[in-house]
Interface confidence: low
């Protein structure tokens, strides 16, 4: 067991051009806080995977109001360290996500409004008990400077916090076969208290008689690799060909512990040691709380923190789901106007506009008729992206230079015959139909079925997004 500690030194504009605007203003004073999420291993885990090593939220920093006209300085930071306790061994390699959040302190009666300013991530190797490691990470125009370390909580020591130390029983030396515990030379390495046979490489214990497995290992003595496909052979003795230890029949056979729990045999049955966020006989009950950092992708956890999962994740733009685990296809909302192409860049939406349009959502219609000419009496029409001509009767094409056949589009409905005419076209309707395009049936009693007025459209309820 131990604690991962993170000290934020500064958060402010990074070097180079394009300094970011201050996130706070006189109209909207704000303060910063930070969230750290830790995951074991160096693998490129999906952003939505849980903070399996733990997560922590800092205190709020001092209230900050931008000085008008001044560039954004390093912003005032919260006091103290962010501490992420870890119950099991320190893995040595880990991934981190550090998020900088802004809490706006306007006159919202409902309390503060939060928004994610920056997120940095990385993968590092770190031995517990070592010195502070310094780091600089950039997110867009922002720069975050911080230090971190992992330290063991007594009586644990060592680079993985798996060795146990106890105060010396005698002032001068440790007991037989026991070494002093560097760097605590006044303490001795504790006698072996783990279950007999517990793997020294893959197992550890915090209490006598225990054998708890490091990630990737299972079995009562932590000697069985998890999910080793070559080991999934029928039950039998240790296989020399696969190099796998195939356990004989026992209560932990097949690992009855769900959700990554590790199984230990007991005299009468088995016992599951559950990972954070789960409990129950087989670790089948989710007891995730805000303390477990259940909100992914920078979601902010609020609400109760009881074992019934009484928390709510407020998701940043672009994510949804009860844990903000799903990326929203924001382009499905068709935010780009006038035929613009939508690009979801994750941190923002971009619209690639067609010629003749501009603006964040291609909403601005440029003057595409400037310097354009339409032949044969055609008039140039704004709003089509590229220049568009509305042609006089009898002409067509991009610039109205082509003589048009008005009957080419078969405009006469219900089998009517089309005749080109100097004023446009004329439809000669088949029996039983009438109208300029033969669109209306003539009833036997002579009344025509003209279309009813279109029904009133009831707009859908507006969607709300957190």
């Amino acid at each position: 067991a131990g604690v991962f500690e993170l000290q934020i030194h500064s958060f402010g504009p990074g070097p180079g051009p394009g300094a970011p605007r201050s996130p706070c203003s006189a109209r909207l004073p704000c303060r910063l806080f930070f969230r750290v999420c830790l995951k074991p291993g160096l693998s490129e885990e999906a952003a939505e995977s849980p903070c399996a090593l733990g997560a922590a939220l800092s205190a709020r920093g001092p209230v900050y109001t931008e000085q008008p006209g001044a560039p954004a300085p390093d912003l005032p930071l919260p006091d103290g360290l962010l501490q992420v306790p870890f119950r099991d061994a320190w893995p040595g390699t880990f991934s981190f996500i550090i998020e900088t959040w802004r809490e706006e302190l306007g006159d919202q009666i409902g309390g503060p409004a939060w928004s994610l300013l920056a997120r940095v991530a990385g993968r590092r190797r770190l031995a517990a008990g070592g010195p502070w490691a310094r780091d600089i990470q950039r997110a867009g125009a922002w720069e975050l400077r911080f230090s971190y370390r992992a330290r063991c909580e007594p009586p644990a020591v060592g680079t993985a916090c798996t060795r146990l130390c106890r105060p010396r029983s005698a002032p001068s030396r440790c007991g037989p076969g026991l070494r002093p515990c560097a760097p605590l030379e006044d303490e001795c390495e504790a006698p072996l208290v783990c279950r007999a046979g517990c793997s020294p490489e893959h197992g550890f214990c915090e209490q006598p008689g225990e054998c708890r497995c490091l990630e990737g290992w299972t079995g009562p003595l932590c000697t069985v690799p998890v999910s080793t496909s070559s080991c999934l052979s029928p039950r039998g003795p240790s296989s020399a060909t696969t190099g796998c230890l195939v356990p004989g029949p026992g209560p932990c056979d097949g690992n009855p512990c769900a959700n990554g729990g590790s199984c230990s045999e007991t005299p009468r049955s088995f016992e599951c040691t559950c990972p954070r966020g789960f409990y129950g006989l087989r670790c089948e009950v989710s007891g995730v709380t805000c303390a477990d950092g259940p909100c992914f992708n920078g979601g902010l956890c609020v609400g109760g923190a009881d074992p019934d999962s009484a928390y709510i994740c407020h998701c940043p733009p672009g994510f949804q789901g009860s844990n903000c685990e799903k990326r929203v296809d924001r382009c499905s909302l068709q935010p780009c106007r006038n035929g613009g192409l939508c690009l979801d860049l994750g941190h923002a939406l971009r619209c690639r506009c067609r010629a003749g349009f501009a603006g964040p959502r291609c909403e601005h219609d440029l003057d595409d008729c400037a310097g354009r000419a339409c032949a044969n009496g055609g008039t140039c029409v704004e709003g089509g992206g590229a220049h568009r001509c509305s042609c006089a009767l009898g002409f067509g094409g991009r610039d109205c230079r082509e003589r048009a056949d008005p009957c080419a589009a078969r405009p006469c409905a219900h089998g009517g015959r089309c005749y080109a005419h100097f004023s446009g076209l004329v439809c000669a309707c088949a029996p039983g139909y009438m109208g300029a395009r033969c669109e209306f049936p003539v009833h036997p009693d002579g009344a025509s079925a003209l279309p009813a007025a279109p029904p009133g459209l009831r707009p859908g309820d507006p969607q709300r997004y957190l």
Epitope: G111, T289, V302, R464
Partner: antibody, heavy 116, light 107 residues
């Protein structure tokens, strides 16, 4: 301006049910949670439960079998129903708008007396 | 359920004095703690949230500190209107539980 107003029956006979309505204004029930809390005369506060903006509810485990919290977002109303009342359920009942997991803005309360 | 033990249950003090009220949680609750003030015949009003943050419109003579299991609430210079009741509430784990309350009285 955020406001919460509780309206209840005032007097309830023992073993009967209690229904209280909390009518809110100045915010949307789809965006914020609402808690119910009670306070017996001259005593401390007891949290009864919460309904979140998304509709999920959480109850005080000691009272869960007797409690129901529902809401009508369109009418801006939250409802507390409590069964099998006894005299020790006599209390001031408050609804409160949750500020996430940080605390709450309370209504004025409604006094419920359980008596024959 | 998490028990919140608030002390003292009542305290006498004079105008201008400082007083401190303590709340102990039966298990660690991080900083998920709020402090409320309740005047006679009125509903409680939020003073402090997240253990240390002052709610909107609350005078700066009120302050909160602590994390984990031990929390303190301090009024630095008592005014006449401060002699009322105060409650802590944990919001870490439902059921969100309150302390028993502290009644401040004028000496």
């Amino acid at each position: 301006q955020v406001q919460l107003k509780e309206s209840g029956p005032g007097l309830v006979a023992p073993s009967q049910s209690l229904s209280i309505t909390c009518t809110v204004s100045g915010f949307s029930l789809t965006d914020y949670g609402v808690s119910w809390i009670r306070q017996p005369p001259g005593k401390g506060l007891e949290w009864l439960g919460v309904v979140w903006g998304g509709g999920s509810t959480y109850y005080n485990s000691a009272l869960k079998s007797r409690l129901s919290i529902t809401k009508d977002n369109s009418k801006s109303q939250v409802f507390l129903k409590m069964n099998s009342l006894q005299t020790d359920d006599t209390a001031m009942y408050y609804c409160a708008k949750q500020r996430g997991q940080y605390g709450a803005y309370w209504g004025q309360g409604t006094l419920v007396t359980v008596s024959a | 359920d998490i028990q919140m033990t608030q002390s003292p249950a009542s305290q006498s003090a004079s105008l201008g004095e400082s007083v401190t009220i303590t709340c102990l949680a039966s298990q660690t609750i991080g900083t998920w703690l709020a402090w409320y003030q309740q005047k006679p015949g009125k509903s409680p009003q939020l003073l402090i949230y997240a253990a240390t943050s002052l709610a909107d419109g609350v005078p700066s003579r009120f302050s909160g500190s602590g994390s984990g299991t031990k929390f303190s609430f301090k009024i630095s210079s008592l005014q006449a209107e401060d002699f009322v009741s105060y409650y802590c509430q944990q919001l870490y784990s439902t059921p969100w539980t309150f302390g028993g309350g502290t009644k401040l009285e004028i000496k």
